[in-house]
């Protein structure tokens, strides 16, 4: 929801968390502001305190329940409001009717591990975290490998167009240190975006056997 120079963006992690960022040019840093969540068809509501993340933007996480509980469904609509204290009263700064499953950003994949490593290849697996059972297998992944002397931004993206929680990296250099990251995105949702990248997994390929043609 955009109002003049105000921007209010939220994402649902598909289970029990809505993360919001509100930015407003010229807003006072010391103003106390909150995000209020009012689902249209639930008995609960939730509030979180917006905390500054930069000169003109604030963020907070609406914790709706235990991490793996399914707190919202595909038909819920949540009214989200930014409320800021002005003296003794609260003023509404931004509002949006939020469709959780149109605005998804999952948690970063976790539990990355090397399943098997050789001189030229490495098999890596991971797990998705706090992802709704709604998605069945309809998720996609992007992965990238950091090679020596390069940056993450230079790393080519590998796309996995299905729910495949492993990858076999090929054509690696023997006895070389690499890092690997992966992120996930559901197919569902007009404004859905990629999860954050996972924590990098460091691994080293095996050295080539002496006297062998590699």
């Amino acid at each position: 929801a955009v109002n003049g120079t105000s921007r209010f963006t939220c994402f649902y992690n598909s289970r029990a968390n809505i993360s919001c960022v509100w930015s407003q040019d010229g807003a006072l840093q010391d103003t106390s502001c909150q995000v209020h969540a009012w689902p249209d068809r639930r008995r609960w509501n939730q509030t979180c305190e917006l905390l500054p993340v930069s000169q003109a933007s604030w963020a907070c996480n609406l914790i709706l329940g235990t991490p793996d509980s399914q707190k919202l469904t595909a038909v819920d609509i949540v009214t989200l409001r930014v409320m800021c204290r002005e003296g003794v009263r609260w003023r509404m700064m931004a509002i949006q009717d939020f469709k959780p499953f149109e605005n998804l950003r999952l948690m970063a994949p976790i539990s990355l591990q090397v399943v098997h490593v050789e001189t030229h290849r490495c098999n890596i697996s991971w797990k998705i975290s706090q992802a709704s059972h709604y998605f069945e297998r309809h998720l996609e992944f992007e992965a990238r490998t950091l090679s020596p002397g390069h940056t993450w931004e230079e790393a080519p993206l590998m796309t996995l167009k299905q729910k495949q929680e492993w990858i076999c990296l090929e054509t690696l250099t023997p006895d070389t240190q690499y890092e690997f990251q992966v992120r996930v995105k559901p197919l569902q949702g007009e404004f859905t975006t990629w999860s954050p990248w996972s924590q990098p997994l460091a691994f080293r390929t095996k050295p080539a056997a002496l006297g062998k043609d590699t």
Partner: antibody
Framework: EVQLVQSGAEVKKPGATVKISCKVS????????IHWVQQAPGKGLEWMGW????????EYAPGFQDRVTITADTSTDTAYMELSSLRSEDTAVYYC??????????WGQGTTVTVSS | EIVMTQSPATLSVSPGERATLSCRAS??????LHWYQQKPGQAPRLLII???QSISGIPARFSGSRSGTEFTLTISSLQSEDFAVYFC?????????FGQGTKLEIK
């Protein structure tokens, strides 16, 4: 292999209630959604509702809300759809289907319900 | 509720030719549109999700596209087993609704 096997054809009188079962196998029933869809002759497909076995919640289409009840028995991996106050226009094939909320990935074979006096 | 209108109601095409089926939503539904195939005496089968994503196991000759509120299912080279009824379904606004179907018959 994913399978949904429905109970057999039913003949009912107007005003009666019908209860159809849908026995599933090949996937984790406790983490699934089971939908029910009506296909009346010459009327196309109508989505009736779902049960979310993990969240323990049901969702019904407004057109069926007053007369339909969807339940599940997780001990037998079976979903049920009960339709009450039957009328002649409820004569149809009823399907159960597995899916996320948004679309129906696997379907049962269908159960024909005939409402006739 | 959103009304899904499919056209034509019946489409006659020769085997080996291309078939184009249309589905129009009465309001904007983003890409929340799914296609099913139903053969006589059988349950529907999911073909395409979110307007253009093929389901695994579905032949590559089936493809989907979108232009605004109009969605198209294209079968590039019709096989005998493709003659059936095709339904679209929206999942943007509750309750989910289906089109009335397009019957694809042999010319």
């Amino acid at each position: 292999e994913v399978q949904l096997v429905q109970s057999g054809a039913e003949v009912k009188k107007p005003g009666a209630t019908v209860k159809i079962s849908c026995k599933v196998s090949g996937f984790n029933f406790k983490e699934s959604l089971i939908h029910w869809v009506q296909q009346a002759p010459g009327k196309g497909l109508e989505w009736m509702g779902w049960i979310d076995n993990e969240a323990g919640e049901t969702e019904y289409a407004p057109g069926f809300q007053d007369r339909v009840t969807i339940t599940a028995d997780t001990s037998t991996d079976t979903a049920y759809m009960e339709l009450s106050s039957l009328r002649s226009e409820d004569t149809a094939v009823y399907y159960c289907a597995r899916g996320g909320p948004w679309f129906l990935s696997y379907w049962g074979q269908g159960t024909t319900v005939t409402v006739s006096s | 509720e959103i009304v899904m209108t499919q056209s034509p109601a019946t489409l006659s095409v020769s085997p080996g030719e291309r078939a184009t089926l249309s589905c129009r939503a009465s309001q904007i539904i983003s890409n929340n549109l799914h296609w099913y195939q139903q053969k006589p005496g059988q349950a529907p089968r999911l073909l395409i999700i979110y307007g253009l994503q093929s389901i695994s196991g579905i032949p590559a000759r089936f493809s989907g596209s979108r232009s605004g509120t109009e969605f198209t299912l294209t079968i590039s080279s019709l096989q005998s087993e493709d003659f059936a009824v095709y339904f679209c379904q929206q999942s943007n606004n509750f309750p989910w609704t289906f089109g009335q179907g397009t019957k694809l018959e042999i010319k």
